[in-house]
Interface confidence: low
């Protein structure tokens, strides 16, 4: 289905001329950013962005690729090199350290330089690196973390934690020897390392003592508290702040976000990670867009500004399962959150960045016809005389042999939300990929986001834009934090 107007060269020339006109008008702002927002699409490589763009368009009965994602509208783009100090292909812990702290670390460590060694507690002390969020708090800004994973997960933990093992969610996950050496679990660090004004996501079970039932699944012991130290970390956090509120469902979140007496808000909506958007109970759990809006309502009260981390964390999980439907619908919700944040903030005083921590071995190919379903089949057959999908994975659990051969696939099968796209190599979980990822930028100092950069550059751009350490002598006008 080719749109008739696209057959005419005038269509393309006019469209390009408009884009060129807009580009010529771009003026780098010489002002500081009062507010910083980093949107992190976990595992959102460029192939994921492209496929999600097409899906977003097709959901609106368009052909697909001509659609704009909210992130596509950001005027400045760079590429980010995602490798960790010890691995070509990184994990979400080492990458979080890079884009949130400005220093590269080792695989599966968080908030530590590469002098720290994975799982070796005694290499922690002295190797801590400080996040931009922590620096923003020191400068008097309000700070928040929003994610669709558990709030103790690798990416959000990069904003507040220092750990040699990203899997140490609660003290039950930390070996006794490491506990004795003084290594703290991530949940404990969430409430004790720094004062975070807004914490929204999953991860209830890591905050409560073993045997504490979960409010949503009280009869499921596996969803209850996991802590061995008997601590109720939510209670401890509430006791720290006069205006603190804890919520665990959507209704309470929406109420709390509009309550002027609430100064600190923790919302934990699932025992572990939040549900995929396609499985979310919209009466109980908020969407990423709703959590982002709630966070912005609270944080934007501070006249000195804010720092906000927003993660679409389950894009990555969908890809690990080789379920592109899940990964792409998560990406669309992530983009919806970016769009809503854009409506609630001004690019005059808010630097917004969108990036990924790493990519996935997810491909989109096979010469499909324009307008054909993103989850559909490529035209024609493969050499084994069977159909194949346009979305595929290099490795992962989608590898299946039936009687020594690759199974055939129909359009109705491949369109199912549960369908696992096929892969070349059988693995229990599909892996990350090592190619560069995009960084989109809008707002004060966004023009600095250009070229091919180390992933660490992202943290430095944010710090410089808001005149945070080590760039307090940033010489930008008006200086950050003078609007009160």
């Amino acid at each position: 289905i080719i749109p008739v107007e696209e057959e005419n060269p005038d269509f393309w020339n006019r469209q390009a001329a408009e884009a060129l006109g807009a580009a010529k008008k771009l003026q780098p702002a010489q002002t500081a950013a009062k507010n910083l927002i980093i949107f992190l699409g976990d595992g959102m490589g460029v192939s994921t962005v492209t496929a999600a763009r097409i899906l977003k368009g097709q959901k609106k009965d368009k052909l697909g690729p001509e659609t704009f994602l909210a992130m596509d509208r950001f005027p400045y783009v760079a590429l980010s090199k995602t490798y960790s100090v010890d691995k070509h292909v990184p994990d979400s812990g080492a990458t979080a350290t890079a884009y949130l702290c400005g220093v590269k670390g080792n695989f599966q460590t968080i908030g530590l330089s590469a002098a720290a060694r994975f799982n070796q507690c005694n290499t922690t002390r002295g190797n801590e690196v400080i996040s931009v969020m922590n620096r923003a708090k020191k400068a008097g800004k309000s700070v928040g973390v929003v994610t669709t994973t558990r709030v103790q997960h690798a990416s959000p933990a990069g904003a507040y934690a220092h750990t040699v093992n990203r899997n140490w969610y609660s003290d039950a996950d930390v070996p006794a020897s490491a506990r004795q050496e003084g290594c703290q679990d991530i949940a404990t660090q969430l409430i004790s390392n720094m004062d975070i004004d807004v914490i929204l996501g999953g991860g209830r079970k890591y905050m409560f003592p073993m045997g504490t039932p979960d409010p949503e699944y009280p009869d499921d012991y596996s969803q209850g508290g996991t802590r061995l130290d008997g601590k109720n970390l939510v209670q401890e956090w509430l006791a720290k702040h006069q205006g603190a509120r804890y919520v665990w469902n959507r209704t309470e979140l929406l109420q709390a976000s509009l309550d002027p007496s609430v100064t600190h808000l923790m919302g934990l909506f699932e025992p572990g990670d939040m549900k995929y958007e396609i499985h979310r109970d919209s009466t109980l759990d908020p969407s990423l867009m709703e959590m982002t809006e709630a966070a912005l309502l609270l944080l934007s009260r501070n006249p000195r500004g804010f720092f906000l981390f927003v993660e679409g964390g389950r894009i990555d999980h969908g890809h690990h399962e080789s379920r592109a439907y899940r990964a792409l619908t998560e990406t669309i919700m992530f983009d919806d959150a970016i769009e809503r944040a854009g409506q609630l903030t001004s690019e005059e005083d808010t630097l917004s960045l969108v990036t990924a921590d790493h990519s996935h071995v997810f491909s989109f190919g096979g010469y499909p016809l324009r307008g054909s379903s993103i989850f559909g089949l490529a035209p024609g057959k493969a050499r084994d005389r069977k159909a194949y999908t346009v979305l595929l994975y290099g490795n992962g659990p989608g590898y299946v042999l039936k009687d020594g051969a690759r199974p055939d696939v129909t359009e109705s099968e491949s369109g199912s939300p549960e369908y696992r796209q096929q892969s070349a190599v059988p693995l229990d979980g599909e892996t990350h990929a090592g190619e560069d990822v995009a960084v989109f930028a809008r707002g004060p100092q966004a023009h600095l986001v250009h070229g091919v950069q180390e992933q660490t550059f992202i943290a430095h751009v944010m710090a410089f834009a808001a005149c945070l350490e080590p760039y307090t002598a940033c010489d930008l006008a008006p200086r950050a934090g003078t609007t009160d």
Partner: nanobody
């Protein structure tokens, strides 16, 4: 702001009755269970009763079973604890609390409570 405020405490004779009230503001009972605790001087805190609007159920501690009953007034967002046949050993500070669990699961564990009231004193003389 979330608040739980108890009222109705006082001095009564053994065998008498007393009704305590717990008024909640800032949240509704729909997503919580309300638990009454008591603490006698020099003794451990003890869970007395739990009422869950969601589950439509009430639970009582062994020492008060058959003598105490809990009820809710949804319109006023209050929970009452009707205490009959009071004994001197019922003398304590009675505190209401809101649990994380909406259906009273694990209701006797203090760590499961999200919000607490200040408490009201009940003295039963012989």
């Amino acid at each position: 702001q979330v608040q739980l405020v108890e009222s109705g405490g006082g001095l009564v004779q053994a065998g008498a009755s007393l009704t305590l009230s717990c008024a909640a503001s800032g949240f509704t009972f729909n997503t919580r269970s309300i638990v009454w605790f008591r603490q006698a001087p020099g003794k451990e805190r003890e869970a007395v009763s739990c009422i869950s609007k969601v589950a439509g159920s009430t639970y009582y501690g062994d020492s008060v079973q058959g003598r105490f009953s809990s009820s809710t007034d949804n319109a006023k967002n209050t929970v009452s604890l009707q205490m009959n046949s009071l004994k001197p050993e019922d003398t304590a500070v009675y505190t209401c609390a809101a649990s994380f669990a909406p259906n009273c699961y694990g209701w006797s564990v203090a760590a499961n409570m999200e919000y607490w009231g200040e408490g009201t004193m009940v003295t039963v003389s012989s």
